[in-house]
Amino acid sequence: FERTRSLQDPCSNCPAGTFCDNNRNQICSPCPPNSFSSAGGQRTCDICRQCKGVFRTRKECSSTSNAECDCTPGFHCLGAGCSMCEQDCKQGQELTKKGCKDCCFGTFNDQKRGICRPWTNCSLDGKSVLVNGTKERDVVCGPSPADLSPGASSVTPPAPAREPGHSPQ
């Protein structure tokens, strides 16, 4: 089948890094500078990605593969293949429409990216706050207040046995 196909379509013989040049009797021509073809049998070469501004070149374009970009220091990649660069903020901040802003009271961000998140509500788990939260750090929850009262046993008593014939509530 491959032989038949190549007899019918001379372009299928053109390897990656070349294109089938219709202007030159369908011979395989090398991709021009700043272009590439990653598969064989291409009728055109694709323009290389250019890494400009906050994008910097991680891998140069070759005749067979596209350039790859990452972000300049102070920015981080977003999206597939680093399609966007987003400015870093400091820990304890988030990126808003007005740039990097401190987390509001009761929220924190322990990374240079992402949004400020609410402190953990320890009481929802029946626990108390062991270490207060900051803009950069979540609260640390400790034992429940009852566990901290004088004379409180750390051993959980066994559950009372149910009387026969009673279904659980």
Partner: nanobody, 122 residues
Framework: EVDLVESGGGLVQPGGSLRLSCAVS????????MSWARQAPGKEFEWVSS???????YYVDSVKGRFTISRDNAKNTVYLQMSSLKPEDTAVYYC????????????????WGQGTQVTVSS
């Protein structure tokens, strides 16, 4: 072909003023949001200011009240008027398109100028 050309940079004393211009060609400028970013020597890139196609503006806190971004759709030009300049404003200033419309975020399809040097020194 898309082209962004910055001009207006130079050496200025602290407290002085400069107006940067960015002349744009090769795409529909009036529909495009634009932005300025800067990179100080040995420091990281920093978003400075952005302007929507409708003229709405945003600024980083450190330049608020001192810098003004504006645009002239008839001249396909975006400006950055900089006053009360400080030594810490010394940087290469870049003009760029702003397709994400998200402050501090640029897309791979955005276009960038080559930059213009601003030096604030006595």
């Amino acid at each position: 072909e898309v082209d962004l050309v910055e001009s207006g940079g130079g050496l200025v004393q602290p407290g002085g003023s400069l107006r940067l211009s960015c002349a744009v060609s090769g795409f529909t400028f009036s529909n495009s949001a634009m932005s300025w970013a800067r990179q100080a020597p040995g420091k990281e890139f920093e978003w400075v200011s952005s302007i929507y196609s409708d003229g709405k503006t945003y600024y980083v806190d450190s330049v608020k009240g001192r810098f003004t971004i504006s645009r002239d759709n008839a001249k396909n030009t975006v400006y950055l008027q900089m006053s009360s300049l400080k030594p810490e404003d010394t940087a290469v200033y870049y003009c760029a398109t702003w397709k994400t419309l998200r402050v501090g975020v640029w897309d791979e399809s955005d276009y960038w100028g080559q930059g213009t040097q601003v030096t604030v020194s006595s």
